[in-house]
């Protein structure tokens, strides 16, 4: 239930960006909600979705921007350390999670071209890894003025402080529950069969369960699809192949935190679904 007790920054840099696209971008996440976006073209950290309305201190977004500009400089500097032909994609996952006892557990790991290769060692206060690329980048970053100290501060102090602030100031966003709007439709499939599709739209949080019943008995969960919407909500669907003419024996059951109890969704009449 406390899946939102984490603050994670997903950082990505590319050595050869396409024209007009950023070389570096970041998404910031409070649990399953994206609250921040940043890219090297705009150069400003900006709130996402409902977090635009969060009652934050005046300098909050300036501080996020300052920190991410430092990260941008480091990430792009990494490509100089790597040399070679490339192209390279460097990713970072930085952040913290609050444990049950309210202590903060930091995360700092890095991947090159999709392979995890380096982390930030909190005890040593340095970046480290066994691979040559980890060595190349960590040496370069270590040479940057106070970079390791800034990383330590970011992970051990800034991140948990921000997370606790968001838990207080943005509690409404974090406790947001949006029940799904539902549809159950049938369409012809291969000869003698139909596909039933149970769709859930605009719900939050993302945890949702869809299953089919036939004459009140479990008929499986079908083949599923799930994804985010631009407003921070989610959509999901599940499809089941049934015999033609048998469609009306089926219904779909949805369970979600925004619903007081499981909701039964009946098949739409052909006239309504046109």
């Amino acid at each position: 239930a406390e899946s939102h007790l984490s603050l994670l920054y997903h950082l990505t840099a590319v050595s050869s960006p396409a024209p007009g696209t950023p070389a570096f971008w970041v998404s910031g996440w409070l649990g399953p909600q994206q609250y921040l976006s940043y890219n090297s073209l705009r150069g400003e950290a900006e709130p996402c979705g409902a977090w635009v309305w969060e009652n934050q201190v005046s300098w909050y977004w300036e501080k996020e921007t300052t920190d991410l500009r430092i990260k941008e400089k480091l990430f792009l500097e990494a490509f100089k350390a790597l040399g070679g032909k490339g192209p390279y994609t460097l990713q970072g996952l930085l952040g913290c999670e609050l444990g049950p006892d309210n202590t903060s557990v930091p995360t700092a790991k890095f991947a090159l071209n999709g392979e995890e290769f380096m982390n930030f060692d909190l005890k040593q206060g340095t970046w480290g890894g066994d691979w040559p690329e980890a060595l190349a980048i960590s040496q370069r970053w270590q040479q940057q003025d106070k970079a390791a100290n800034k990383e330590l501060t970011f992970l051990l102090f800034s991140c948990p402080h921000r997370l606790r602030e968001h838990l207080e100031r943005g509690r409404g966003n974090l406790e947001w529950k949006e029940p799904p709007s539902m549809r159950l439709k049938a369409r012809p499939s291969s000869p003698g069969f139909s596909v039933l599709t149970c769709s859930a739209f605009s719900f939050y949080p993302p945890e949702l369960q869809l299953r089919f019943l036939r004459n009140g008995l479990a008929a499986g969960t079908g083949q599923g699809d799930f994804g985010p919407n631009s407003d921070g909500s989610f959509h999901a669907s599940s499809s089941l192949t049934v015999k033609s003419g048998d469609e009306h024996h089926y219904c779909c059951i949805v369970q979600h935190a925004g619903l007081a109890q499981p909701l039964r969704v009946e098949l739409e009449s052909p006239a309504k679904s046109s």
Epitope: A81, G83, G84, E115, D130, W131, P132, E133, A136
Partner: antibody, heavy 118, light 106 residues
Framework: QVQLQESGPGLVKPSETLSLTCTVT?????????WHWIRQPPGKGLEWIGY???????NYNPSLKSRVTISRDTSKNQFSLKLSSVTAADTAVYYC???????????WGQGTLVTVSS | EIVLTQSPATLSLSPGERATLSCSAS?????MHWFQQKPGQSPRLLIY???NLASGIPARFSGSGSGTDFTLTISSLEPEDFAVYYC?????????FGQGTKVEIK
């Protein structure tokens, strides 16, 4: 075109130190490659030993770490392998290789056979 | 460390036949590389990052796979393809090689 050439004694006595050098031609140690030693006992598979990066940093196979040292001489465009306290089990063809783009070994030396025997 | 197991140990085929070599990893890896080695020669890179053909390698060689199971395929064996083939991973430290598959003339 980059070429690698291993050199060193072909016979080493047990408990002594094996020393090999790899000479790199067509490239100088300046830009983002790593340089590796790999060995192959007669009739067997390949075993990675360790690397030195263009930056000068090194790392070794945990199974050999206590006995291995890899170093370089940029003025001669060479990097070297030292393996101490050798036994008959260290008899192998030793290859030097370059790792391209932090992905794969694209250039190999022709290999040199080192026999450990008294 | 990740152990790579190649099968079969030996593959006896005739020129023109299709060769399928397998490499199984003890844990999931992102990519696999393949090398060819002929007697008295050093290994030569054939396929990098699972499916990319190295420079100068003929198109009859192809690679595929993901997770723990990877395959090298030679669509139609030429006389010069009879050699030992090794898979290699560098997803998990240290880098490791398979024990090799020998492709011999039947």
């Amino acid at each position: 075109q980059v070429q690698l050439q291993e050199s060193g004694p072909g016979l080493v006595k047990p408990s002594e130190t094996l020393s090999l050098t790899c000479t790199v031609t067509g490239y100088s140690f300046t830009s983002g490659y790593s340089w590796h030693w790999i060995r192959q006992p007669p009739g067997k598979g390949l075993e990675w030993i360790g690397y030195i990066h263009d930056s000068g940093g090194t790392n070794y196979n945990p199974s050999l770490k206590s006995r291995v040292t890899i170093s370089r001489d940029t003025s001669k465009n060479q990097f070297s392998l030292k393996l101490s306290s050798v036994t008959a089990a260290d008899t192998a063809v030793y290859y030097c290789a370059r790792e391209e783009n932090y992905r794969y070994f694209d250039v190999w030396g022709q290999g040199t056979l080192v026999t450990v025997s008294s | 460390e990740i152990v790579l197991t190649q099968s079969p140990a030996t593959l006896s085929l005739s020129p023109g036949e299709r060769a399928t070599l397998s490499c199984s990893a003890s844990s999931s890896v992102s990519y696999m590389h393949w090398f060819q080695q002929k007697p008295g020669q050093s290994p030569r890179l054939l396929i990098y990052s699972t499916s990319n053909l190295a420079s100068g390698i003929p198109a009859r060689f192809s690679g595929s796979g993901s997770g723990t199971d990877f395959t090298l395929t030679i669509s139609s064996l030429e006389p010069e393809d009879f050699a030992v083939y090794y898979c290699q991973q560098r997803s998990s430290y240290p880098p490791t090689f398979g024990q090799g598959t020998k492709v011999e003339i039947k």
